[in-house]
């Protein structure tokens, strides 16, 4: 029984489930938005290519004091293989181009829905 105990413990979350949960969280943010999200903070725009999740996290992690996106930041960190800290600047950021957090989240949601439909889960 001790040996079999391992089978009952939860394994890693399948990529499809993780992506679906991230999409659901972004839907919650966009639907429950009353005041300007994160007080209208601006973040770096990103290229939606390989490494997109890390780039998205690197952009959003620079928004401080915004509880609405804290869960999204945590979820994105699960898609990013390396540790991300504030101030990092990826080559996937579009230099000198910032957009509002609300637009960033909305557009990221649009893109992730397309990836999910196409079966691109990570």
């Amino acid at each position: 029984l001790t040996c079999l105990g391992g089978f009952a413990s939860p394994g890693p979350v399948p990529p499809s489930t993780a992506l679906r949960e991230l999409i659901e969280e972004l839907v919650n943010i966009t639907q429950n938005q009353k005041a300007p999200l994160c007080n209208g903070s601006m973040v770096w725009s990103i290229n939606l290519t390989a490494g997109m999740y890390c780039a998205a996290l690197e952009s959003l992690i620079n928004v401080s004091g915004c509880s609405a996106i804290e869960k999204t930041q945590r979820m994105l960190s699960g898609f990013c293989p390396h540790k991300v800290s504030a101030g990092q600047f990826s080559s996937l950021h579009v230099r000198d181009t910032k957009i509002e957090v609300a637009q960033f989240v909305k557009d990221l949601l649009l893109h992730l829905k397309k990836l999910f439909r196409e079966g691109q889960f990570n």
Epitope: S45, T49, Q103, L108, L110, H111
Partner: nanobody, 118 residues
């Protein structure tokens, strides 16, 4: 906010060519399917062409098929429309727009005028 800025319109003779550009800002351009719509003088809006977010799938109205080519450069946040063998009936204001079914993702440019005349 979101801005779509068209350029490249002008006066051209029948049979000539023009290349329209649409520079996008304030949004994650590569997330969007995009398209071109035109409005001839005194007429309604007419869909011209659209392209998926990756640039791999393109669609054209029968009236421009074989003459117009839509493309995009996601690294430059820019949409293009190459127009060849232009005809008088192509005279119109050409608008760049997002081409998404979902509500809330509808953005349009201000348009650029194309006049085909000798």
């Amino acid at each position: 906010g979101v801005q779509l800025l068209e350029s490249g319109g002008g006066l051209v003779q029948p049979g000539g060519s023009l290349r329209l550009s649409c520079a996008a800002s304030g949004l994650l351009f590569a997330a969007y399917d995009m398209g071109w719509v035109r409005q001839a003088p005194g007429k309604g809006l007419e869909w011209v062409s659209s392209i998926d977010w990756k640039g791999g799938k393109t669609y054209y109205a029968d009236s421009v098929k074989g003459r117009f080519t839509i493309s995009r450069d996601n690294s430059k946040n820019t949409l293009y429309l190459q127009m060849n063998s232009l005809r008088a009936e192509d005279t119109a204001v050409y608008y760049c727009a997002t081409a998404e079914d979902e509500p809330g993702y509808d953005y349009w440019g201000q348009g650029t005028l194309v006049t085909v005349s000798s």
